[in-house]
């Protein structure tokens, strides 16, 4: 399987919200003994590769931010938690998965990761992630809402 | 802060099942792989297994014969079970917590279980 | 399985030196390693994860590099307090294993 970004770019305002998002692609093993960890973090361009530092998301560390099968998030705690720092993260039956963040200040610029796990018990983990980047602009240039840009090319959308 | 606690008797007659649990506080034990690995004395580390949240496990097969792994959300316990122990099983047994993808990042202190007749 | 050869077993240095940890799989980890520094009486703590990342509080002196079957652990100036065994674990198959550990002493 796959992760795809439907964007590689969210340009949006100060005090905005915007989600960002991730799909799964390709044949999903729904075996008993295939689970799915999903998850958000910040990161860099690394040296190595892209996503590979896992970075806290407003404090958030990768593990507050996870997500199991196509369910809600797992845990209550994290949930709360995730609320309480402006944020929501949420996934569906069809592969789609997502991160929302509130109240959009310029120090949440910079480059987030999905990450999925494909966990084959008894046998191995397959990871593969997803990167985009945020930028969140303030002043007469910044737009009045988020603009995203399609990883396929560099046609824009504005989304309210 | 999650924290782990493992518990069980110390002294464990050969040929008999050594009986550890492990109990998960300050967090949900409901994500997660929950393992156990240990640690012959003066020796290094070997991991015995782990049970996920969803209640699937895996064993090391050096020992999967002998190795039983259960949890128990309700107590936010896991435990191990390992049958027919002899000598060679003497050892600190740990608990910890392995995150998918990442590594085992909370660990318990620790229990010495000492198998002598 | 993976079998992971740490190298040296033992390494003696005094504090302020520059310690240079090996560890070789049996065949290739992608970057999929981990390490953990362990003290007497002590549960192994996490130090690097995914070859090269630090964990959550672990200090600048500590890093990791590698991928494939070679890699090392570097403490850039050792303080009193990391003299301790190491040990590098992989996760890229299960069962998941560590190597023998490299015991860093005062010199």
């Known amino acids: 399987f796959k992760v795809a970004t439907p964007y590689s770019l969210y340009v949006c305002p100060e005090g905005q919200q915007v989600t960002l998002t991730c799909r799964l692609l390709g044949p999903v093993d729904k075996g008993h003994d295939v689970t799915f960890y999903k998850t958000w973090y910040r990161s860099s361009r690394g040296e190595v590769q892209t996503c590979s530092e896992r970075r806290p998301i407003r404090n958030l560390t990768f593990q507050d931010l996870h997500l199991h099968h196509g369910g809600h998030q797992a845990a209550n705690t994290s949930h709360d938690l995730a609320q309480r720092h402006g944020l929501e993260s949420a996934s569906d039956h069809h592969g789609q998965f997502s991160i929302t963040m509130r109240n959009l200040t310029l120090l949440d610029s910079g480059l987030y990761c999905c990450l999925v796990v494909e966990i084959r018990h008894h046998h191995s983990e397959h990871r593969v992630h997803g990167a985009m980047e945020l930028q969140v602009q303030t002043g007469k240039d910044a737009p009045s809402n988020c603009v995203v840009y399609p990883s396929s090319s560099q046609d824009s959308e504005n989304i309210t | 802060q999650v924290q782990l606690q493992e518990s069980g008797p110390g002294l464990v007659k050969p040929s008999e099942t050594l009986s550890l649990t492990c109990t998960v506080s300050?967090?949900?034990?409901?994500?997660?792989?929950w393992s156990w690995i240990r640690q012959p004395p003066g020796k290094g580390l070997e991991w015995i297994g782990y049970i996920y949240y969803s209640g699937s496990t895996n064993y090391n097969p050096s020992l999967k014969s002998r190795v039983t792994i259960s949890v128990d959300t309700s107590k936010s316990q896991f435990s191990l079970k390992l049958s027919s122990v002899t000598a060679a099983d003497t050892a600190v047994y740990y608990c910890?917590?392995?995150?998918?993808?990442?590594?085992?990042?909370?660990w318990g202190q620790g229990t010495m279980v000492i198998v002598s007749s | 399985e993976i079998v992971l050869t740490q190298s040296p077993a033992t390494l003696s240095l005094s504090p302020g030196e520059r310690a240079t940890l090996s560890c070789r799989a049996s065949?290739?980890?992608?970057?999929?390693l981990a390490w953990y520094q362990q003290k007497p009486g002590q549960a192994p703590r996490l130090l690097i994860y995914?070859?090269?990342n630090r964990a959550t509080g672990i200090p600048a002196r500590f890093s990791g590099s590698g991928s494939g079957t070679d890699f090392t652990l570097t403490i850039s100036s050792l303080e009193p307090e990391d003299f301790a065994v190491y040990y590098c674990?992989?996760?890229?198959?299960?069962?998941?294993?560590f190597g023998g550990g490299t015991k860093v002493e005062i010199k």
């Open positions: 674990q992989q996760r890229i198959s299960w069962p998941l294993t």
């Open positions: 300050g967090g949900s034990i409901s994500s997660y792989y």
């Open positions: 995914d070859a090269f």
């Open positions: 910890a917590r392995d995150i998918p993808a990442f590594a085992f990042d909370i």
């Open positions: 065949q290739s980890v992608n970057y999929y």
